[in-house]
Interface confidence: medium
């Protein structure tokens, strides 16, 4: 038994041109959460259990509203860690699916909307009991960043959590520095061992006699901060010319950038430059491949020709997505009634009403004139599943709060003036003209001329 | 955690007028519908109603129409279920229900129940 | 309105042994919208099953829902001495929302 978490780093626009706009809008705030699902990576996945190594979902973020004209930031994530534990042995390659979701929250009928926001997915390698694995993984314009690992919960031990070690009572035959373990009297369990002076804070080893290094940090024993100058000490006052007395490891020393990735200094760090299938700051990750087994129940995997989709998945009937993930869209059932909207959030359909109904296929009609008075005298008039307030001469607005201007459709003919009045409005007309809004003009001789017929 | 707290249990006379309060805690209200569900003695549960509390839209069942008023205050999170010219068959346990937080799921969330007695 | 009926009316069990109460609609109920209740003496119904087969939060999965069209079913896989109440279907696929008259489930 054990557990499987994921941290999420950050979420927001990749890199490049085409950089989405912020998922949450001034008028719409919303907040994220994240799903994971887990599937053991070397069996063929049926369709019937998704998620057969199980699933977790975060809490919800922070909301968020977009500030207009901004560009979209990484968006405020929800705190902790996902944790999905499993039962049995964990199985060393794995599959995973994370999905980041959007609630919106604004005063929409029903409550909140969710909708996918981005999908990635993935297989991996992973021994339980290692450190973090750092991940970058994109979904269209979108770009996630994340750890995990796979830990075992006591008193399992191993790789694969199958095995029980507890501190026994009786003295210990295994040698200094191993743990004597259940159920084999004899068998005692080595700690993995580093190589020799690897940094504990900021090195890790997967295999015995290794040394690597976490983000920010290079050098054989990691013991060198990636921004450290290339100056160990500068030269004495009696150099005339400036650079470094004795050269300190620079920040490529060594060569940081793994799978040929060539590196090359930076005022403050260094960057890689990775071949065609690698990323990541060190271009330790891997763009998914049709060796990842990205394709899920049943999918069949192609090799993409476009660098940047380097598979392509042909999905089983029933299915459908990049990654074949989805099931064939049940909205095409069309089960939202009343003109509402569908969304098929995998689980579940959800429909979004038009205004005036209500429920989960919008089959209320509701009665939009119950609760809600017009104001100032104004009566309430439905129709089409919404209300309006058919209001008192001189009130506005969708309720009849406010106050109308008569006069501002400049109702007055000929320069006449406007007055608004408790009854409605009165023209006073310039000189030489008549009538309520001043449209006919005086005769010299006292009648008005009108034109005649 | 979310709570749905409903008035006490009132005594009227036929033809006289009800009205039960239900106070929500624990959610954002104005994001869940709340529907009126009612339960006469030993029988079984009727549903009256639904309001919008973002809105306070409303649509009743038909044999209520015209004798229920459902009204919602949003700045005590409360929403109220008026039934007029009460009669004997409208003695009842008078609930309200939110509606679940889960896309395609129905009341999860209950009033404690309100006993209305219809007498002369 | 769609008019729900259950069946049996009381159904005496005892412990341990397997319920399986039925549900009926006069006209067809979209599966994702059909829910079963339990009520106990003197509270509020308790939603077990939401969507025909999909359990509500902290219900025990010794409950399970099936059925689809105009015939549903709430089966109890072995009955604990917690599980004796009236259940309630439920259909919120179309306006009015109705409920089935209840099944009262009772030790033998």
């Known amino acids: 038994a054990g557990v499987f978490e994921l941290q999420i780093h950050s979420f927001g626009p990749g890199p490049g041109p085409g950089a989405p706009r912020s998922p949450c809008s001034a008028r719409l705030p919303c907040r994220l959460f994240f799903r994971v699902c887990l599937k053991p990576g070397l069996s063929e996945e049926a369709a019937e259990s998704p998620c057969a190594l199980g699933a977790a979902l975060s809490a919800r973020g922070p909301v968020y509203t977009e500030q207009p004209g901004a560009p979209a930031p990484d968006l405020p994530l929800p705190d902790g860690l996902l944790q999905v534990p499993f039962r049995d042995a964990w199985p060393g390659t794995f599959s995973f699916i994370i999905e980041t979701w959007r609630e919106e929250l604004g005063d929409q009928i029903g409550g909140p909307a969710w909708s996918l926001l981005a999908r990635v997915a993935g297989r991996r390698r992973l021994a339980a009991g290692g450190p973090w694995a750092r991940d970058i993984q994109r979904a269209g314009a979108w770009e996630l960043r994340f750890s995990y690992r796979a830990r075992c919960e006591p008193p399992a031990v191993g790789t694969a959590c199958t095995r029980l070690c507890r501190p026994r009572s009786a003295p210990s035959r295994c040698g200094p520095g191993l743990r004597p373990c259940a159920p084999l009297e004899d068998e005692c369990e080595a700690p993995l061992v580093c190589r020799a002076g690897c940094s504990p804070e900021h090195g890790f080893c997967e295999q015995p006699g290794e040394c690597r290094c976490l983000e920010g940090w290079t050098g054989p024993l990691c013991t060198v901060p990636v921004s450290t100058s290339s100056c160990l000490s500068p030269r004495g006052p009696s150099s005339a010319t400036t650079g470094c007395l004795v050269p300190g490891p620079g920040p490529c020393d060594g060569n940081p950038c793994a799978n040929g990735g060539s590196c090359s200094e930076t005022p403050r760090s260094f960057e890689c430059t990775c071949p065609r299938g690698f990323y990541g700051l060190r271009c330790e990750v891997s763009g998914v491949t049709c060796a990842d087994g990205p394709c899920f129940n049943g999918g069949l995997c192609v090799g993409g020709a476009d660098p940047d989709s380097a598979y392509i998945c042909h999905c089983p009937p029933g299915f459908q997505g990049s990654n074949c993930e989805k099931r064939v869209d049940r909205c095409s059932l069309q089960p939202c009634r009343n003109g509402g909207l569908c969304l098929d959030l995998g689980h579940a359909l959800r429909c979004r009403c038009r205004a005036g109904f209500a429920g989960p296929r919008c089959e209320h009609d509701l009665d939009d004139c119950a609760g809600r008075a017009c104001a100032n005298g104004g009566t309430c008039v439905e129709g089409g599943g919404a209300h309006r307030c058919s209001c008192a001469l001189g009130f506005g607005g969708r309720d009849c709060r406010e106050r109308a201007d008569p006069c501002a459709a400049r109702p007055c003919a000929h320069g006449g003036r406007c007055y608004a009045h408790f009854s409605g409005l009165v023209c006073a007309c310039a000189p030489g003209y008549m009538g309520a809004r001043c449209e006919f003009p005086v005769h010299p001789d006292g009648a008005s001329a009108l034109p005649a017929a | 955690q979310v709570q749905l707290v409903q008035s006490g249990a009132e005594v009227k006379k036929p033809g006289a007028s009800v009205k039960v309060s239900c106070k929500a805690s624990g959610y954002t209200f104005t994001s869940y519908y709340m529907h009126w569900v009612r339960q006469a003695p030993g029988q079984g549960l009727e549903w009256m109603g639904i309001?919008?509390?973002?809105?306070?839209?409303?649509s009743y069942a038909q044999k209520f129409q015209g004798r229920v008023t459902m009204t919602r205050d949003t700045s005590t999170s409360t929403v109220y279920m008026e039934l007029s010219s009460l009669r004997s068959e409208d003695t009842a346990v008078y609930y309200c229900?939110?509606?679940?937080?889960?896309?395609?799921?129905?009341?999860?969330?209950w009033g404690q129940g309100t006993l209305v007695t219809v007498s002369s | 309105e769609i008019v729900l009926t259950q069946s049996p009316g009381t159904l005496s069990l005892s412990p341990g042994e397997r319920a399986t109460l039925s549900c009926r609609a006069s006209q067809s109920v979209s599966s994702s919208y059909l829910a079963w209740y339990q009520q106990k003496p003197g509270q509020a119904p308790r939603l077990l099953i939401y969507?025909?087969?999909s359990w509500a939060t902290g219900i025990p999965d010794r409950f399970s829902g099936s059925g689809s069209g105009t015939d549903f079913t709430l089966t109890i896989s072995r009955l604990e001495p917690e599980d004796f109440a009236v259940y309630y279907c439920q259909q919120y696929d179309s306006s009015p929302y109705t409920f089935g008259q209840g099944t009262k489930l009772e030790i033998k």
């Open positions: 229900a939110r509606v679940a937080d889960i896309v395609g799921a129905t009341f999860d969330y």
């Open positions: 969507g025909a087969s």
């Open positions: 309001i919008n509390p973002s809105g306070g839209s409303t």
